[in-house]
Interface confidence: low
């Protein structure tokens, strides 16, 4: 006869593992028991369990409650044992052993291979602004045996960077990516992808990239010149920017007060019915966490009365 | 994005052969194995062939057992289901499933069923 | 090959409803135990393998445990999308078998 196994049996942390054991005999041929035991280099030889013929299975303490028979039914020539919920410290060389009659005794040998999963943590980098130079946008790191795989998935244009630790059982691997801060990266996704054996499928952790930034403010509403004459409604200018974090706007009136009546609704300037007291130098400020601009209109409300042309100067300044 | 699509389905007499197609994508498919699922109308799920990666063992139900035969073209990333000397119990909606790549490389244990295809209709009568 | 026995065969359920339907094998299968939700015209989905892992992407209101010869699949507070038919799946030996169904109807 002849002793089948597995020269690895390959698991997930937690899972249970089957170690093959099967006396394939000639016709007649019996076990009386078998011995498994695991039989790591340089360590003597720990007793696992025994399966007797008999007396049916023993399980040494050190593994009490972990190791049982594959279920029924069961064929007397097989040996196999189940090793419940693996973990990283039984990884190692099993041996089982068979006492067989009249053949006498076989061994063989298998190694256990205990995958651990990776639980995958992303750690964004500092602040990202509009301006920056090259720039950590965010790293990732797993830790796993074997070690596992660090990717990433995004639009978003960047240099990658990655480096391994190895522990005993197990090795850590951190990705870096790094990008330049621009404004079309504002809510774009940054994922990192961690890929591994004993993965049912690939984990993805998701950041979200906040980059700050503030656009040139502009103001509109003087398009129309002839519309800005006196007892005309409804007359506003707007002011134009945008940014993140999202700006606030505030006017005011380079040459005094802002009139009586004129109303101030974030980035829009109402004003009551014309007159020439509304002429004058309005500068919209915009400004965020980030940074501030200015844009400043000249409005020249014109009398009907008179023929003179209105001038309108626009003056961006930031 | 897995994708799995079933073809080759459509009506067939009794005593009669049809081969179903299995167009995998998004996936690498050599490392996957595969299975056939059948649905008759109104009634419920029946395994009916897989395929492993490891040494291509193929296993069948004891009801189709002889008459069908799996197989896989890894080249085309194509799953196969060659069905000869179809019967009337035949009839039903075939699935093609793939297996999640589990850990232990061994024939004796199958996998859940991760992906699934939209099923092509079997039907066999005179 | 391995039986597997659902209960019960349909339910009716309300929104909001905890819902439980048990799987028994006719002998022991570890944890090598699949769920999955089937709507009409459709080809099922996997929501919990290994007896008590919710498949990514499932929501959490679906939760399985058991191991050996006895599973539940539980929905903790039913949806209107999860009116469906449910069946679990023994892949510890070939062939792999499954648990005739059970609907769950609106009540």
């Known amino acids: 006869g002849e002793l089948e196994t597995s020269d690895v049996v390959t698991v997930v942390l937690g899972q249970d593992a089957k170690l093959p054991c099967f006396y394939r005999g000639d016709s007649g041929e019996q076990v009386g028991q078998v011995a498994w035991a695991r039989v790591d280099a340089g360590e003597g030889a720990q007793e696992l369990a025994l399966l007797h013929s008999k007396y049916g299975l023993h399980v040494s303490p050190a593994y009490e409650g972990r190791v049982e028979q594959p279920p029924p039914p069961r064929n007397p020539l097989d040996g196999s044992v189940l090793l419940r919920n693996a973990v990283q410290a039984d990884e190692g060389e099993y041996e089982c052993r068979v006492s067989t009659f009249p053949a006498g005794s076989f061994q063989a040998r298998l190694r256990l291979r205990v995958l651990v999963p990776p639980l995958p943590s992303l750690n964004p980098g500092p602040a990202l602004e509009e301006g920056q130079g090259l720039t950590l946008a965010a790293s990732c790191t797993a830790e796993g045996s074997p070690a596992p795989s660090v990717t990433w998935d995004t639009e978003v244009k960047g240099t990658t960077s990655s480096r391994s630790f190895k522990h005993s059982r197990s090795a850590a691997v951190t990705s870096e990516f790094h990008l330049v801060p621009s404004r079309s990266m504002n809510g774009q996704p940054l994922t990192c992808v961690v890929s591994h054996p004993g993965l049912l499928q690939d984990q993805r952790i998701t950041h979200i990239l906040h980059v700050s930034f503030l656009a040139e403010a502009s103001v509109r509403g003087l398009e129309d010149q002839n519309l800005w004459h006196i007892g005309r409604e409804g007359a506003m200018l707007k002011c134009l920017s945008e940014g993140q974090p999202p700006p606030s706007y505030n006017w005011t009136r380079l040459d005094g007060p802002l009139p009586s009546g004129v109303r101030v609704d974030g980035d829009t300037l109402g004003f009551p019915p014309l007159t020439t007291e509304h002429s004058g130098i309005y500068v919209c400020h915009v400004s965020n966490e980030f940074s501030s601009r200015d844009s400043q209109v000249t409005v020249d409300v014109l009398d009907p009365q008179e023929d003179s042309g209105k001038q309108v100067d626009l003056v961006s300044a930031s | 994005e897995v994708q799995l699509v079933e073809s080759g389905g459509g009506l067939v007499q009794p005593g009669g052969s049809l081969r179903l197609s299995c167009a995998a994508s998004?996936?690498?498919?050599?490392?996957?194995?595969m299975s056939w699922v059948r649905q008759a109308p109104g009634k419920g799920l029946e395994w009916v062939s897989g395929?492993?990666?490891?040494?291509?063992?193929?296993r069948y139900a004891d009801s189709v057992k002889g008459r069908f035969t799996i197989s896989r073209d890894n080249s085309k990333n194509t799953l196969y289901l060659q069905m000869n000397s179809l019967r009337a119990e035949d009839t039903a909606v075939y699935y093609c499933?793939?297996?999640?790549?589990?850990?232990?490389?061994?024939?004796?244990?199958?996998?859940?069923?991760?992906?699934w295809g939209q099923g092509t209709l079997v039907t066999v009568s005179s | 090959d391995i039986q597997m026995t659902q209960s019960p065969s349909s339910l009716s359920a309300s929104v909001g409803d905890r819902v439980t339907i048990t799987c028994r094998a006719s002998?022991?299968?570890?944890?090598?135990l699949a769920w999955y939700q089937q709507k009409p015209g459709k080809a099922p989905k996997l929501l919990i393998y290994?007896?008590?892992s919710l498949q990514s992407g499932v929501p959490s209101r679906f939760s399985g445990s058991g191991s050996g010869t006895d599973f539940t699949l539980t929905i903790s507070s039913l949806q209107p999308e999860d009116f469906a038919t449910y069946y679990c799946?023994?892949?510890?030996?070939?062939?792999?078998?499954f648990g005739q169904g059970t609907k769950v109807e609106i009540k």
């Open positions: 499933a793939r297996e999640y790549s589990d850990v232990v490389d061994y024939v004796s244990v199958r996998t859940p069923l991760d992906y």
């Open positions: 998004g996936y690498s498919f050599t490392d996957y194995d």
């Open positions: 395929i492993k990666t490891y040494k291509s063992d193929a």
């Open positions: 002998q022991g299968i570890s944890s090598y």
């Open positions: 290994a007896a008590s």
């Open positions: 799946q023994q892949h510890y030996t070939t062939p792999p078998t």
